[in-house]
């Protein structure tokens, strides 16, 4: 069972001092999602017993395995059901505590009732404050039964539940009709899934015979031991004031476990700690009684004395629960109550015994759960004991269960049962995850889900180049940390696998599935520098750069040009995919912007050092396009262009630019400046006869503006071929050719 205890502090004079604490003895309990298990949860469960809303309760985590609930302001806050949930996966377990008001009309004689399937359960509610009206019994909040107030027997209302079945489990309450539920007696009924002394799916297996009030779990056959007892059969008492499956926890405060209610996983339920009894667990056991709720009687023989925490303390020469066994009778010594081995191992198990006559090798035997008897292979005889060693055949899962060591001599016999847990070594269900990669290293997360049993003691990463037959390299890592595989080859695929181990011999699991992880290329090391740049328009920039000369091939796939617009906080990246390129035209830039420019060599996904940055100012955008452009042939070599000035000018035009291109021609267009911005007409001269031309124009202020519409016109026929077009502005008195 999960080692989970819910403690209720019942010193109820002041509700503000009341607290509930949930303590887990499980490895890794409560550490949350970053560890191997989910956190502990402690809460009031209002599904069945609803109380008036009050201020929210305060939850405090004390370390990784303890959580405490405080902040109760009035007694009614305490009434009801509280639950603690702990353990991971299939072991997730809920522990329930039911709190009754000490001032209620009706009080339970016993809050927790654990019964076997088919038993008759009797719930008894004692009258504390009488009302002459019906008593209503409810089950999980719904009506169950009515009793007339005359039906009280000896001041108690009894609810008999014959032939109970597991679905009958739950919270029961007895309340006077039309009285506040806070005055109810609340009970918890736990119905084991099997009849007395049985466990397992078909209830075919026999319980180990839990001692000292321990309860056999109907699913796994383990004894859930009362607080203050430990061992496979709860045969061993803890020191006073201690609890937990291994007696590892200590009751808080100077008065030990006085005033504390302990709730454990079903089917145990709740009780006082060992040595205490009463509705508030504040009364010490009466003489001759001991254990949780003082339910056990000592009945010590042969001069034994009764200790209210541990039972009979035997004088020299006697042993046994009631000091009924003479030390002459053989006795198994110091047998561990629980052993754990890994699947398919062949462990050695030792069993020591003493007695008179002295046990010999043949008088000690080991019995497996299936009834197979093993004889010892050797025995070590010492003055006070004989230790028999048994070589166990290769373990299978069916070997899990209760084993028994038995010693028989003419003086009598003794046996000791102990639990053997056969654990399955963990096997990863997934491949490790690649986090980051470089040319010579890979950073890997080894933490993966697994089948089999924890806890994980070591994680091994095995890796080697893909398609290689060389030995695997292995690194042992911490399961919760990322691992860096170093000194790898660049641009190489590696097969990487995880292997998990649990504690103990043979705890290494099979390797998990492989995954392919590829190292990056070598980092480019050369630093380019910017040779120069020039503006080719308000939104165009030509950039050139150089690289230092080094021997050997160039390590690089191309260049990355970066333009940083600090005003807008925007970066523009331009990829030049040839390592031979030393120039690039950047287009679509924002006119009038101040850019910071640099260039880097790249190889695969890796960037080399950036060049020293340059600062470039693009001219602002130009004016709108000229309007109504019109072309008119004047002769076989002249065409006149007329237009109207652009509208909404941001400033005075410095010039116009005319673009001339032969229609259908393949060559570059020719640009001609009109330096008299006030003109609205110009003549283009030196054109070829009978040739179709395309014209468009734009204005310039600080930068060139938008192009106008394109117009077409043909020169007149059959003149001589001219040397090339030139322009003359109309009304230009000088008549200079340009």
């Amino acid at each position: 069972a999960v080692d989970l205890t819910l403690l209720a502090n019942l010193r109820l004079t002041d509700p503000q001092r009341f607290f509930l604490t949930c303590v887990s003895g499980e490895a890794g309990a409560g550490r949350g999602s970053d560890a191997w298990g989910p956190p502990l949860l402690l809460e009031k469960d209002d599904r069945i017993v609803r109380t008036p809303p009050g201020p929210p309760l305060r939850l405090a985590r004390n370390g990784s395995h303890q959580v405490t609930l405080r902040g109760f302001s009035k007694p009614s806050d305490l009434v009801g059901v509280f639950s603690c949930v702990g353990g991971a996966g299939a072991r997730r377990t809920r522990v329930i505590y039911v709190h009754n008001s000490p001032g209620a009309h009706l009080l339970p004689d016993k809050v927790t009732h654990t019964v076997n399937k088919g038993d008759t359960a009797v719930l008894s509610a004692r009258v504390h404050k009488e009302k002459q009206t019906d008593v209503i019994w409810k089950s999980n909040g719904s009506y169950f039964y009515t009793l007339d107030w005359h039906e009280a027997q000896d001041g108690r209302f009894l609810l008999q539940l014959p032939n109970v079945q597991p679905p009958s489990s739950g919270i029961y309450s007895a309340t006077y009709l039309e009285a506040s539920p806070l005055g109810s007696a609340f009970f918890r009924l736990i119905v084991r899934g099997c009849g007395a002394g049985r466990w397992g799916p078909g209830c075919t297996k026999e319980c180990p015979g839990c001692l000292h009030g321990g309860v056999c779990h109907d699913h796994d056959g383990e004894c859930v031991c009362p607080p203050g007892f430990t061992g496979t059969r709860c045969e061993q008492a803890c020191r006073e004031g201690r609890f937990g499956q291994s007696c590892q926890e200590q009751c808080p405060g100077i008065s030990g476990c006085r005033g504390l209610t302990f709730c454990l996983p079903d089917p145990y339920g709740c009780s006082c700690g060992s040595g205490w009894r009463g509705s508030q667990c504040q009364e010490a056991c009466a003489p001759g009684h001991f254990g949780a709720d003082c339910r056990l009687q000592c009945q010590c023989q042969n001069g034994g004395t009764c200790d209210r925490f541990s039972g009979c303390v035997c004088p020299s020469g006697w042993h046994g629960v009631h000091c009924e066994k003479s030390d002459r009778i053989p006795q198994i010594l110091n047998m561990a109550s629980e052993l754990e081995f890994n699947l398919e191992t062949m462990p050695r198990i030792n069993c020591a015994a003493a007695g008179n006559p002295f046990p010999v090798r043949g008088s000690i035997e080991l019995r497996k759960p299936d009834g197979t008897v093993l004889l010892s292979t050797k025995a070590i005889v010492e003055p006070e004991k004989t230790t028999a060693e048994f070589e166990v055949p290769r373990l299978v899962l069916a070997d899990s269960g209760f084993w028994e060591c038995r010693v028989s001599t003419s003086g009598g016999q003794d046996s000791r049962r102990f639990k053997v847990n056969v654990k399955v070594p963990p096997v990863p269900l997934a491949a490790p995850r690649l986090l980051t990669k470089q040319s010579r290293q890979l950073v890997v997360s080894p933490l993966v889900s697994f089948s089999g049993d924890g806890p994980i003691s070591t994680v091994r990463l095995h890796y080697r180049p893909q398609d290689s037959t060389m030995d695997w390299s292995t690194i042992v890592v911490d399961p919760s940390e990322n691992v860096t595989l170093m000194n790898l080859r660049p641009k190489t695929g590696y097969s990487v696998r995880v292997q998990l181990s649990r504690p103990g011999e043979g705890g290494e699991g099979a390797w998990g599935p492989p995954t392919l992880m590829t190292t990056d290329c070598p980092e480019p090391l050369l630093q380019p520098w910017l040779e120069g740049w020039h503006v080719e328009g308000t939104d165009r920039l030509r950039v050139s750069w150089s690289l230092p000369l080094v021997p050997g091939p160039l390590v690089g796939d191309g260049f990355l040009l970066r333009l940083w617009d600090g005003t807008r906080g925007q970066e523009r990246r331009e990829n030049v995919s040839s390592p031979q390129a030393r120039t690039a035209l950047l287009t679509g830039l924002t006119p009038g912007t101040h850019y910071q420019l640099d260039v880097q060599l790249y190889h695969c996904t890796l960037l080399g050092p950036a060049s020293p940055p340059a600062h470039v100012l693009l001219p602002p955008s130009g004016p709108p396009a000229p309007r109504h452009l019109h072309a008119q042939a004047l002769s076989d070599s002249e065409i006149q262009l007329t237009w109207k000035h652009p509208e909404a000018l941001p400033g005075p035009i410095s010039k116009y630019v005319v673009e001339v291109q032969v229609a259908g021609g393949a060559g570059d267009p020719l640009w001609i400046d009109v330096d008299r911005p006030e003109e609205t007409s110009t003549i283009i001269r030196g054109l070829n006869a009978s040739t179709r031309y395309l014209f468009r124009m734009r204005a310039s202020i600080q930068g060139l503006g938008d192009w106008s519409n394109t117009v077409e016109e043909s020169t007149l026929g059959n003149g001589l071929q001219a040397e090339g077009p030139v322009q003359e502005s109309r009304a230009a008195e000088e008549g200079l050719d340009q």
Partner: antibody, heavy 124, light 107 residues
Framework: EVQLLESGGGLVQPGGSLRLSCAAS????????MIWVRQAPGKGLEWVSS????????SYADSVKGRFTISRDNSKNTLYLQMNSLRAEDTAVYYC?????????????????WGQGTLVTVSS | QSALTQDPAVSVALGQTVRITCRGD??????SSWYQQKPRQAPVLVMF???NRPSGIPDRFSGSTSGSTASLTITATQADDEADYFC??????????FGGGTKLTVL
């Protein structure tokens, strides 16, 4: 579905006897308190008798005390009303009903499930 | 003399609100319940406890208690609400009492 079915009514002479039955189905009869209520022609409802789930505790209206006996057979899911020394004023439709209790904050008793009634006529 | 007293008859205009009352000392200690009965039919529970309506009863029906008086209020009264209405309560001995009934007429 909860069902209650009364039977056993009829014509009887004053001083005579009659036994009414109420067959219950659709619920765990042995866990519920049951009652008989009657209604004389053109009159209001009158509680007659109650019996607790165990059958050990019963109560009666003053008008029928000593003459009527309520009982139950939990194994047969049946409620009974034995009526002796009948009088003309006992003429009425007799209903059996189940006592219910709200599952709210306070448990209040009420009668949500009724039979269809059986007529008892006491006349010479 | 009935220990739970009701007005014998109450009338209400269609669509209006009507209040039917029930008076008795035991209402100070115990909750009441209300039953609707139409001719030649068994009673039907319409209200119980503090102000609880069984499923199937429209929210036009509501209940309240003040001192020794319990009330059943019907808003937006419909023709189908015309019936006899009985209040009921108990005592500590488990004895039950019904009021004399109120005949509700919807005009």
């Amino acid at each position: 579905e909860v069902q209650l079915l009364e039977s056993g009514g009829g014509l009887v002479q004053p001083g005579g006897s009659l036994r009414l039955s109420c067959a219950a189905s659709g619920f765990t009869f042995s866990r519920y308190k049951m009652i008989w209520v009657r209604q004389a022609p053109g009159k209001g409802l009158e509680w007659v008798s109650s019996i607790y789930p165990s059958g050990g505790t019963t109560s009666y209206a003053d008008s029928v005390k000593g003459r009527f006996t309520i009982s139950r057979d939990n194994s047969k899911n049946t409620l009974y009303l034995q009526m002796n020394s009948l009088r003309a004023e006992d003429t009425a439709v007799y209903y059996c009903a189940r006592s219910d209790l709200g599952s709210g904050w306070y448990s209040a008793e009420y009668f949500q499930h009724w039979g269809q009634g059986t007529l008892v006529t006491v006349s010479s | 003399q009935s220990a739970l007293t009701q007005d014998p008859a109450v009338s209400v205009a269609l669509g209006q609100t009507v209040r039917i009352t029930c008076r008795g000392d035991r209402l100070r200690s115990y909750y009441s319940s209300w039953y609707q009965q139409k001719p030649r039919q068994a009673p039907v529970l319409v209200m119980f406890g503090r102000n609880n309506r069984p499923s199937g009863i429209p929210d036009r029906f509501s209940g309240s208690t003040s001192g020794s008086t319990a009330s059943l209020t019907i808003t937006a009264t419909q023709a189908d609400d015309e019936a006899d209405y009985f209040c009921s309560s108990r005592d500590g001995s488990g004895n039950f009492l019904f009021g004399g009934g109120t005949k509700l007429t919807v005009l």
